[in-house]
């Protein structure tokens, strides 16, 4: 057992059929030695008296909010939660597995640009009762400071017959230098807490890794005289890390109408514009990459050819 | 400790392409590596981030862009001095700064020509012959340093006697490969700011 | 299986001209662009043009700007390369090539052998 | 337009060794290069396109690299099948322009 937060513990149990489970020593944060009394939950039902309680934790039925009392006031209170353990593994029963970039992807972490500013984001399909925690460093042993936001529904989507919601958080390292050269990963911890169940998620990663720049902005259309080909321009998003000639982005270019199948022109870049072929109907999109360090793909940015 | 922005006289700055062709090349080799040792831990997050050149070159801080140098992060420099003259520095107007950088960037080559040449010497033993540094990427090194033409004392190959630890050997190369390439991607990003300057 | 297949090959005269065909199979005739490509004997590639046939949109080489038309006929899933003002170095197998990509050709015909000769 | 060098023009080979071969474009062109294979009295077949992306149905010993100005074609071990002749092609801007071709030879 150990302690999450003030009054609010963690216990770690093996799950399977019929297991021991753990015991739990309970103790009432009070002066008072006499006429101590112990209940669970909203029931009124006597668990158990003096300033301590031993209970068998075996089950959810077992978890809660302990109260102990004396004559009809509280004294204080411990909420236990369970953590399982299922054949040697924690439970991930809370969060949903994104499979992207690989199984047991849990926790989705991206980054703007270099400044030591990050966003992770979840999923899970349970609507109520849900809380989490955050916390970040630099490496695990002597850590540096990483400070994370509070986690937030960022949104909310219909998946077949079920809800899928979406929580993020911000984070940013405390002091960074973006172009410093990273030797230590960021460990991310998530705690989650749905009803009596916890869990723990957590992500590792340079920051170099999780680059996925804004999309290119400002994209303009020159046609070219005499020739179906027209020049594309755009700019390096606002968000990208500065000097642009130091953290240089590179850029694909194409041409293509609404259904992916559909023929296109397609062109790669490290400038700020391109010579690519019109079609009635079609887009240009243009979207971003470090130059250098072969990260994310922005999303696109599109403009109609006509 | 950092490089200015009036440099190099307009035209290709002459260590641009071969900055280009070492991250491409050892780029390669990594990815090489990665497929040739797949039962070997050899992916970034398998590996311990080890940087060789650590304490005793700042190319990062020596050669930061004039316009980090308002963030105090970044400034945790350490003093080391360098040689001062070099080929890449393509007009007069160049200041000890940027040959400080460049320098400093001579001497990473410097560290780790040395490193992957007694490193390949011991792979040549190995009787499984499974992997061997790409000649490219050697010849690449080779070139840079020609091109930013520092004049230093030669580093010694080092020899060792006893008999090479092969797994431990081909470990110490994805090490080695990873923190190369991503010294090569700060080089690249400063020939670039060099070029543009 | 996409397949291109070409004409027959041709002798032609200087200053005549020749219209070699390219008939697809395999996929939707206009979802690809069509381009044609030449080889002289011992001699390295070189792109003459290119056609949508959606639009009949076409871009050809400065090289042969004025001496080249593409073609295509949706109906029977062709295009056409019509040279004209033959010289003896027209000489060469002339290939169709195509691709959803407009820059490059993932699938290249069996070359039409054009030679010109008085 | 721009000019795509080979080199070199003629690569002599033992089989089962492998073979690289290179192409510069005169002027910069990321990674708009696509390489083909071609054997006597056949059209050339596409091997990689963008440089580095590989093609479904190539074998994987066929890899490229590059990008800007220097651009390598490298197969890892030469089986009988692939002595033939190699273009580079560049996509940057029209005119496509090609390659002179290597000649990838028994040795």
């Known amino acids: 057992i150990w302690e999450l937060k003030k009054d609010v513990y963690v216990v770690e149990l093996d799950w399977y059929p019929d297991a021991p489970g753990e015991m739990v020593v309970l103790t009432c944060d009070t002066p008072e030695e006499d006429g101590i009394t112990w209940t669970l939950d909203q029931s009124s039902e006597v668990l158990g008296s003096g300033k301590t309680l031993t209970i068998q934790v075996k089950e959810f039925g077992d978890a809660g909010q302990y109260t102990c009392h004396k004559g009809g006031e509280v004294l204080s209170h411990s909420l236990l939660l369970l953590h399982k353990k299922e054949d040697g593994i924690w439970s991930t029963d809370i969060l949903k597995d994104q499979k992207e970039p690989k199984n047991k992807t849990f926790l989705r972490c991206e980054a703007k640009n270099y400044s030591g500013r990050f966003t992770c984001w979840w999923l899970t399909t349970i609507s109520t009762d849900l809380t989490f925690s955050v916390k970040s460093s630099r490496g695990s042993s002597d850590p540096q400071g990483v400070t994370c936001g509070a986690a937030t529904l960022s949104a909310e989507r219909v998946r077949g017959d079920n809800k899928e919601y979406e929580y993020s958080v911000e984070c940013q390292e405390d002091s960074a230098c973006p172009a410093a050269e990273e030797s230590l990963p960021i460990e991310v911890m998530v705690d989650a807490v749905h009803k009596l169940k916890y869990e723990n998620y957590t992500s590792s990663f340079f920051i170099r890794d999780i680059i996925k720049p804004d999309p290119p902005k400002n994209l303009q259309l020159k046609p070219l005289k005499n020739s179906r080909q027209v020049e594309v321009s755009w700019e390096y998003p606002d968000t990208w890390s500065t000097p642009h000639s130091y953290f240089s982005l590179t850029f694909c270019v194409q041409v293509q109408g609404k259904s992916k199948r559909e023929k296109k022109d397609r062109v790669f870049t490290d400038k700020t514009s391109a010579t690519v072929i019109c079609r009635k109907n079609a887009s240009i999109s243009v979207r971003a990459q470090d130059r250098y360090y072969s990260s994310s793909w922005s999303e696109w940015a599109s403009v109609p050819c006509s | 400790r950092n490089l200015p922005v009036a440099t190099p006289d307009p035209g290709m700055f002459p260590c641009l392409h071969h900055s280009q062709n070492l991250l491409r090349a050892v780029s390669n080799m990594l990815q090489k590596a990665r497929q040739t040792l797949e039962f070997y831990p050899c992916t970034s997050e398998e590996i311990d981030h080890e940087d060789i050149t650590k304490d005793k070159t700042s190319t990062v801080e020596a050669c930061l862009p004039l316009e980090l140098t308002k963030n105090e992060s970044c400034l945790n420099s350490r003093e080391t001095s360098f040689i001062t003259n070099g080929s890449c520095l393509a007009s007069r107007k160049t200041s000890f700064m940027m040959a400080l950088c460049l320098s400093s960037i001579y001497e990473d080559l410097k560290m780790y020509q040395v490193e992957f040449k007694t490193m390949n010497a011991k792979l040549l033993m190995d009787p499984k012959r499974q992997i061997f540094l790409d000649q490219n990427m050697l010849a690449v090194i080779d070139e840079l340093m020609q091109a930013l033409n520092f004049n230093s004392e030669t580093v010694p190959q080092k020899s060792s006697l006893e008999e090479p630890d092969f797994y431990k050997t081909k470990i110490k190369l994805c090490i080695l490969l990873h923190a190369f390439r991503i010294r090569a991607v700060t080089i690249d990003r400063v020939m670039s700011y060099l070029n543009a300057s | 299986q996409v397949q291109l297949v070409q004409s027959g090959a041709e002798v032609k005269k200087p200053g005549s001209s020749v219209k070699v065909s390219c008939k697809a199979s395999g996929g939707t005739f206009s979802d690809y662009y069509l381009h044609w490509v030449r080889q002289a004997p011992g001699q390295g590639l070189e792109w003459m043009g290119w056609?949508?046939?959606?639009?009949?949109?076409?871009e050809y080489a400065p090289k042969f700007q004025g001496r080249v038309t593409i073609t295509a006929d949706e109906s029977t899933s062709t295009a056409y390369m019509e040279l004209s003002s033959l010289r003896s170095e027209d000489t060469a197998v002339y290939y169709c090539?195509?691709?959803?990509?407009?820059?490059?050709?993932?699938?290249i015909g069996q070359g039409t052998l054009v030679t010109v000769s008085s | 337009d721009i000019v795509m060098t080979q080199s070199p023009l003629s690569l002599p080979v033992t089989p089962g060794e492998p073979a690289s071969i290179s192409c510069r474009a005169s002027?910069?062109?990321?990674?708009?290069l696509h390489w083909y294979q071609q054997k006597p009295g056949q059209a050339a077949r596409l091997l990689i396109a963008?440089?580095?992306q590989s093609i479904s149905g190539v074998p994987s010993r066929f890899s490229g690299s590059g990008s800007g100005t220097d651009f390598t074609l490298t197969i890892s071990s030469l089986q009988p099948e692939d002595f033939a002749t190699y273009y580079c092609q560049q996509s940057n801007s029209f005119p496509l322009t090609f390659g002179q071709g290597t000649k990838v030879e028994i040795k």
């Open positions: 090539a195509r691709n959803k990509e407009l820059r490059y050709f993932d699938v």
């Open positions: 056609i949508d046939p959606e639009n009949g949109d076409t």
């Open positions: 963008f440089a580095s």
């Open positions: 002027q910069s062109i990321s990674i708009n």
